[in-house]
């Protein structure tokens, strides 16, 4: 058992491209850092992995498809988020968000367990960011990016908890 | 509404250094991010640089490792340093700020101009 970190969240929906400047920025503290993630403030677009039948991010050929900066082709900073679960293990999710360069990993929790969060475990996988959020904020955000809309999340560094009991999966 | 002030352009011979300065004011959200793109004589504009929610810097290949962007957030202001400049380099040069995210079209300045001479 260790001690937890909360994370702050600061997350805005938009409609891209529309040309409507409105904006909702909506601050919680819905988090949890992973007890191997660096404890760091990371800001980006939230990007699910492609496919229909890849949200657990367990095949190691799991993609995902980046937005870019205006009127260019560079990459802006973005956020993997995956769901719990699918049969690997926490470090294999983030380790893989790393590899295809997120600058962090959300990873949400399994459907009923509504706002749960636990704390990961994931030795080996400590180069990006990775906090868990709640199923019922996850799906919030995976069904707003099915619809098109562009969901950017800020992280910021909460408060000190624990201990809790780890999990690696 | 945003308004952008860019400053700091020039002639310069092959080799040397600028640094360009843009100062927003008006509507600006917390989580703005600015930036420059170019337009050459001819050209379309291009992306050069930006840095988004003061955290994350994206550079144009053509440019990396001798353009450095950053921001003074305290005075809404973006800095483009631009160092070992090649006569390629000469355009006008435009700020461009978002009050979303730097995906979405941007706010443009009216530009400064920017001549490399070999």
């Known amino acids: 058992a260790e001690a937890v970190w909360t994370a702050y969240l600061n997350v805005s929906w938009r409609v891209p491209h529309t040309g409507v400047n409105r904006t909702v920025w909506e601050l919680s503290e819905e988090g949890v850092y992973g007890q191997d993630s660096p404890l760091e403030p990371v800001a980006g677009v939230l990007v699910p992995p492609d496919g229909p039948g890849a949200l657990n991010a367990c095949n190691p050929h799991t993609n995902f498809t980046v937005p870019t900066v205006w009127g260019s082709t560079v990459q802006v900073s973005w956020l993997a988020l995956i769901q719990r679960g699918g049969g690997c293990t926490f470090a294999d999710k983030i380790h893989l968000a790393y590899e295809r360069g997120a600058s962090g990993a959300v990873i949400f929790n399994f459907p009923g367990t509504r706002n749960e969060v636990i704390p990961m475990s994931h030795p080996g996988a400590v180069d990006i960011v990775a906090i868990m959020i709640g199923n019922l904020k996850g799906t919030k955000i995976l069904q707003s990016i099915q619809r098109g809309i562009q969901v950017t999340m800020v992280i910021e560094v909460g408060k000190k908890h624990g201990p809790w009991v780890n999990h690696y999966s | 509404q945003v308004q952008l002030q860019e400053s700091g352009g020039g002639l310069v011979q092959a080799g040397g250094s600028l640094r360009l300065s843009c100062a927003a004011s008006g509507t600006i959200s917390y989580y703005y991010a600015m930036g420059w793109y170019r337009q050459a004589p001819g050209k379309e504009r291009e992306f050069v640089a930006a840095i988004d929610l003061g955290t994350s810097t994206y550079y144009a290949d053509s440019v990396k490792g001798r353009f450095t962007i950053s921001r003074d957030n305290a005075k809404n202001t973006v800095y483009l340093q631009m160092n070992s400049l090649k006569p390629e380099d000469t355009a006008v040069y435009y700020c461009?700020?978002?009050?979303?995210?730097?995906?979405?079209?941007?706010?443009w300045g009216q530009g400064t101009q920017v001549t490399v001479s070999s």
């Open positions: 461009a700020a978002w009050s979303d995210y730097v995906t979405e079209l941007p706010y």
